[in-house]
Amino acid sequence: EEELQVIQPDKSVSVAAGESAILHCTVTSLIPVGPIQWFRGAGPARELIYNQKEGHFPRVTTVSESTKRENMDFSISISNITPADAGTYYCVKFRKGSPDTEFKSGAGTELSVRAKPSAPVVSGPAARATPQHTVSFTCESHGFSPRDITLKWFKNGNELSDFQTNVDPVGESVSYSIHSTAKVVLTREDVHSQVICEVAHVTLQGDPLRGTANLSETIRVPPTLEVTQQPVRAENQVNVTCQVRKFYPQRLQLTWLENGNVSRTETASTVTENKDGTYNWMSWLLVNVSAHRDDVKLTCQVEHDGQPAVSKSHDLKVSA
């Protein structure tokens, strides 16, 4: 009688993460008597995946009724596959004894797992920066397999070229991560701009995955100030306005100084928004000319988004 053979017909099996993998194994004879065990890997460090005789293997089910006496099909199904399950699986026949001894192994089936990349996460600088400055954005995506992946950066639909990308680890692994850093030069018009990181992978049936960052969270556009004297309202009163233009974000505090002394402080509230996302605001000060004998230096001092104050002055002539 021919000696028992352990047949694993599939050299390799590929499965999508989250699915089940079926690993086929049949034996050609019922003799010798003894159980079948499945291992991942070979040698002393091999990992037991399934033991027909004993043990609890919650993710493994037998494809046929392996408890039947005449059964020769020892195929198994492993549920909820993850990249960590990749490897070569061996179906091994044991001879019954005390203890059971290994009799013959199948040639092995290599299980390869394809896994989608996670949604890319884009993060910008911790502190805001002003126009003309270069800022860095990072994009990360994890858990994909195989290793091949493409990553592109866009600013408002225009592809960026100044970036560096790494896929880790460099060698063989069950899954991979990608990390990319892009440099972006800010402009005054960038409040409404978006930076997009786009990741394409063989497993993606839809369009590439996208992560976005709004430059509104990164940019600070400092205000321009203009102080003007309005026509006299009443005989002794002059209206002076301070136009605060094109600033972002909205957080702004304005202080009026008369000859260096604080006259009034207010916080920007009813601002108007420009098309580019920046804000304008106007503050006015009513100066009683009759209270001053000499010329008055009026200063509009603005503290924007916690930055050092900027100011603009206006000399008010007091005619004798």
Partner: antibody, heavy 116, light 109 residues
Framework: VQLVESGGRLVQPGTPLTLSCTVS????????MGWFRQAPGKGLEYIGI?????SPYYASWVNGRFTISKTSTTMDLKMNSLRSEDTATYFC?????????????WGPGTLVTVSS | DIQMTQSPSSLSASVGDRVTITCRAS??????LAWYQQKPGKAPKLLIY???FLYSGVPSRFSGSGSGTDFTLTISSLQPEDFATYYC???????????FGQGTKVEIK
Amino acid sequence: VQLVESGGRLVQPGTPLTLSCTVSGFSLSSYVMGWFRQAPGKGLEYIGIISSSGSPYYASWVNGRFTISKTSTTMDLKMNSLRSEDTATYFCARVGPLGVDYFNIWGPGTLVTVSS
Amino acid sequence: DIQMTQSPSSLSASVGDRVTITCRASQSINSYLAWYQQKPGKAPKLLIYSASFLYSGVPSRFSGSGSGTDFTLTISSLQPEDFATYYCQSWHYISRSYTFGQGTKVEIK
């Protein structure tokens, strides 16, 4: 799971034509789909794909001559100003469940003949 | 664009023969290569994907190997139903485009 192409016929050069691929047994919103063609006695040629979310991508030679679109159960290939060299059997196909690098389900094809 | 060069363009073989068809890519496509079988008047049928994975329901006499630029389809023992034309198809993960080889016709000797 089935794909069936339709719309192929004899047309004169310069005429537009739209081919349809009707799917059953799966959802077009879950898979990338592709169009291919094969001129008589020649090899297979890739035309373009449409992603599960509806974005089309084309082979570099297409140059705007063809447009791929889809509804919930059909994928269309709109061909403008046909030429004699467009005479071919046109196939639609679905990519595999593991990824977009291969096509595991194909329709039987529909023949387009461009001749005056 | 990537070019795929298949060889031979045709071959004659007998039932039971071992048949090998090769496909070479003009640049690396890693393992993104599929093999199809096509019979006259029919649609292509997938045999192998990812260079070496046998598609469900395909007889085990078909096998694929290779990675990078050089790939092989092997039929270990040719059967009467295997007389057909075979195509390789690449997918390039950067351009996300597909290219076919020109085909290999396997005829009865």
